[in-house]
């Protein structure tokens, strides 16, 4: 299953498959998750070790049996891949690094005003894999403002060093946040040149070009089919780059496919697993387990859910199958794909789908009236659980926020509902980020189910928890998937990086914001939150967040929406924005419900009809 | 409208018991937070102790430990100050009060006289 | 436990003065210092929390300030029904009122 937790100052011993450089535990972690052998890392901050040549080395790890012994190091982290995470995979990675300079080829050199603005730029090339910037008051005056892009053979640094004044960071192709675009077109019958980064064998373009798209080097590919005259090249995918980004030329070629890369697609890329099976054709590799299952789709669910398995044949062969059920072979090799593909046999083949985002149709928990005031613009993909509830009566207008948990499920407040419990009149809009943008042909979700608690008292404090079930469920996107729950009665993990988002009013007696806007907030205790509010019982079912100075806060039209805080590299649905004494205020802070103290009325229904919970658990 | 009604006058000997009733009208008292509050004749104000009738959870002035304690009944939403051991020192007007971080609607209080 | 000392205990004033009242704290109670008034015969009625913050419905002539372990009431242009006793309270740790200040007519 899906495992989470990161273990501090500890360094598996043995399982070494690859290594690198890398700015954190959190972009190791992902490497892992997308190397086909890693199963676990361990990475050694710069303050952990002393050898320069190993400071920021990300060491990626296999093991036969899922686990390798822990030895103690002071500062180092190892954790786990998130195969099998299910919409916790991604190969976004947005943070920017301060004081550390990310090395590689510098093929591109630039002045601009800002990180960010050097962060859109490696985004905009496509060439760039990640980049840095020397801000205003680098030493040398003559590389101030210098935004520099960078590439290297296998898309990480090829060194990082600690220095002042210097911000890195990595492109946002992987986030589909590239304006450059992409060709989606198949071209048949068409071998393009250059060089050839990587060969792989495919059963079919499709599944080259996913692999072309998930390659750090990859920007156009060639597949040979398997009806190619040379045998020794049929089902061969080569992923290719050029100095120009494009082909520099390209040959007619009966049985070739060649496309290109869709890292540069614009608001949706493909999901970085293969999920179609092949009838009539076997695929070949290191044997990791036989076993009787009843039907391909078994087979594959069994190589899903065995983490090593990254391949499998079904044999219908009469020797190969007892009853209704036949073997299925569950396979691996050492760059994830098949080292043979034959045709023309009894066999199903395909992939294992561990690295599918989309998860099972489940709410994700781990197991460890009230714009947004003094906040700022949020970007494309930056919370893409946030959903807008609007009303329809005679107008169309955003009422509150809620958070994504599952693919038909939506938390917010109840106080939301006061006076609109009828289901119809309420439109719920996902993966959007400026509100004009709606039209009348933006999808929406409608409503099945409204579940207030029931506790809740109108226009009360107490118990303001709504889930709502959509009527048909949603596919995750980097722009629209869930957050995660916290564990039930998580009161021992100190959150120290929270943020509450929404399109509510800026000010006290504003108006509804058209870009969502994001505040980061500091959690205040209970206790220090009581004080504040002195004709309101704060309880331990509620959380407080807000400065002591006030000015920035969650406002009308946030309400329902979430609070959101960041631990071990994971956000977590720490509140819902209930309610406050004005907006921003000294000394008031935010009151929202604290999401831990009802995750077992959350699990309780969220429960499926068949009695089996839609609770997906990474931990 | 948010009220509270707090029981009649008492007159108890030394030594004995005595329980004083605060029944809250518009309003829960579950969802806030039920403090007493003594004042002796001519005197200051002295906080008791506070419950929190959701969970009968407590408080106390450490002073008063002992002397005083807190109940509430959600059923009838009304809490409860038992005081125990009487002495002439007890002879005062004890005040229910609702509030969160403090006391911001009272009761019109209950004389406790305390005498042979 | 802290200690809140207030003070004057009494004071004569007349209509249209400026009265001002301190309380003391023996250790910083991070401005959790709220202000009430009493009339003879009746409960206690809050008028400041959080060392400034008037509570709804309570006349702007009433006004708080301080910092750390020193704190003022004042009422700006004293009126005949603010002729009453005026204690503080402090609510950092636990709950201590001051003595009292008696505001007597003139």
């Known amino acids: 299953g899906c495992l989470t937790q990161l273990y501090e100052n500890a360094f598996f011993r043995g399982g070494d498959v690859a290594s690198m450089y890398t700015p954190n535990a959190q972009y190791c972690q992902m490497r892992c998750t997308f190397h086909p052998r890693c199963l676990l890392f361990s990475f050694l901050p710069a303050s952990s070790i002393n050898d320069m040549e190993k400071r920021f080395g990300c060491f990626l790890k296999d093991s036969v049996t899922g686990t390798l012994p822990k030895v103690h190091r002071t500062g180092a982290v190892s954790g786990h891949s998130l195969k099998q995470c299910g919409h916790q995979i991604s190969a976004c990675h947005r943070d920017i690094y301060k004081g550390v300079d990310m090395r590689g080829v510098n093929f591109n050199v630039s002045k601009v005003s800002s990180v960010e603005e050097c962060q859109k730029r490696c985004t905009s090339n496509i060439r760039c894999q990640f980049f840095s910037y020397a801000t205003q008051t680098f030493h040398k005056a003559e590389y101030r403002n210098n935004c520099l892009l960078k590439y290297s053979p296998g898309g990480t640094p090829t060194a990082i060093k600690v220095l002042s004044n210097v911000e890195s960071g990595f492109s946002l192709k992987p986030c589909a946040l590239s304006e450059i675009g992409c060709h989606m077109n198949i071209f048949q019958h068409l071998a393009f040149s250059d060089v050839d980064v990587a060969r792989v064998l495919t059963p079919d373009a499709f599944v080259c070009r996913t692999i072309c798209t998930y390659h750090p080097n990859c920007l156009f590919f060639t597949f040979y089919t398997n009806v190619w005259k040379i045998e020794s090249q049929r089902n061969v995918c080569l992923l290719k780059t050029s100095e120009s980004g494009t082909p520099s030329s390209s040959t007619p070629q009966e049985n070739t496919i060649s496309g290109y890369s869709l890292l540069t697609c614009k608001r949706t890329l493909p999901e970085p697993c293969h999920s179609k099976i092949y009838p009539g054709v076997d695929f070949g590799g290191e044997e990791l387990n036989v076993t009787f299952v009843k039907g391909v789709n078994v087979c594959q669910e069994t190589c899903t859910k065995m983490i090593r398995c990254q391949f499998f044949t079904y044999s219908l062969l009469p020797e190969d199958c007892k009853e209704e059920k036949c073997k299925c072979f569950l396979r691996l090799s050492m760059d994830g794909s098949p080292t043979r593909i034959a045709y023309g046999t009894q066999g199903s083949s395909g992939y294992s789908l561990r690295l599918c985002n989309t998860g099972d149709n489940s709410v994700c928990t781990t197991k460890t009236s009230t714009r947004i005031v003094g906040g700022t613009n949020s970007s494309w993909g930056e919370w893409p659980w946030q959903v807008s509830l609007q009303v329809k009566l005679t107008a169309q207008r955003h009422l509150c926020g809620g958070s994504l948990i599952g693919h038909q499920w939506v938390l917010t407040a109840a106080h939301c509902f006061d006076g609109l419990p009828l289901q119809d009149v309420w439109r719920i809009y996902s993966g959007i980020l400026n509100l004009s943008d709606i039209t009348k042909d933006t999808p929406f979700s409608q409503i099945k189910e409204i579940i207030i608690h029931q506790n809740y008292k109108v226009s009360e404090g107490n118990h303001d928890i709504a889930l709502i079930k959509l009527q048909a469920p949603l596919n995750y996107t980097e722009f629209q998937k869930p957050i995660c729950l916290p564990s039930k009665g998580d009161t021992s993990t100190i959150y120290t990086n929270c943020w509450v988002t929404g399109w509510g009013f800026s000010k006290e007696k504003g108006e509804i914001q058209n870009i969502l806007q994001k505040v980061n907030i500091p959690l205040v205790t209970n206790e220090e939150c009581q004080k504040r509010y002195q004709d309101y019982k704060i309880t331990q079912r509620m959380v407080c967040a807000g400065y002591k100075e006030g000015g920035k806060d969650a406002c009308k039209g946030d309400s329902g929406g979430p609070l959101v805080c960041k631990h071990n590299g994971m956000w977590r649905l720490v509140g819902i924005t209930s309610w406050g004494e004005g907006c921003a205020r000294r000394e008031q802070p935010g009151v929202y419900t604290k999401v831990a103290e009802y995750m077992d009325w959350i699990l309780e229904k969220t429960q499926s009809s068949d009695g089996k919970a839609q609770m997906q658990s990474p931990a | 409208e948010v009220q509270l009604q707090q029981s009649g006058a008492e007159l108890v000997k030394p030594g004995a018991s005595v329980r004083l009733s605060c029944t809250a009208s518009g309003f829960n008292i579950k969802d806030t937070y039920i403090f007493w509050v003594k004042q002796r004749p001519k005197q200051g104000l002295e906080w008791i102790g506070r419950?929190?009738?959701?969970?009968?959870?407590?408080k106390y002035d450490p002073k008063i430990q002992g002397k005083a304690t807190l109940t509430a009944d959600t059923s009838s939403n009304t809490a409860y100050l038992q005081l125990s051991s009487l002495t002439s020192e007890d002879s005062a007007i004890y005040y229910c009060a609702k509030g969160g971080g403090l006391f911001a609607y009272w009761g019109q209080g209950t004389l406790v006289s305390v005498s042979a | 436990d802290i200690q809140m000392t207030q003070s004057p205990s009494s004071l004569s004033a007349s209509v249209g003065d400026r009265v001002t009242i301190t309380c003391e704290a023996s250790?910083?109670?991070?401005?959790?210092i709220a202000w009430y008034q009493q009339k003879p015969g009746q409960p206690p009625k809050l008028l400041i929390y959080y060392t400034s913050t008037l509570q709804s419905g309570v006349p702007s002539r009433f006004s708080g300030s301080g910092s750390g372990t020193e704190f003022t009431l004042t009422i700006s242009n004293l009126q005949p029904e603010d002729f009453a006793t005026y204690y503080c309270?402090?609510?950092?740790?636990?709950?201590?009122f001051g003595q009292g200040t008696k505001v007597e007519i003139k």
């Open positions: 419950i929190d009738p959701e969970n009968d959870n407590t």
């Open positions: 309270l402090q609510y950092d740790n636990l709950f201590t």
């Open positions: 250790h910083d109670i991070n401005n959790y």
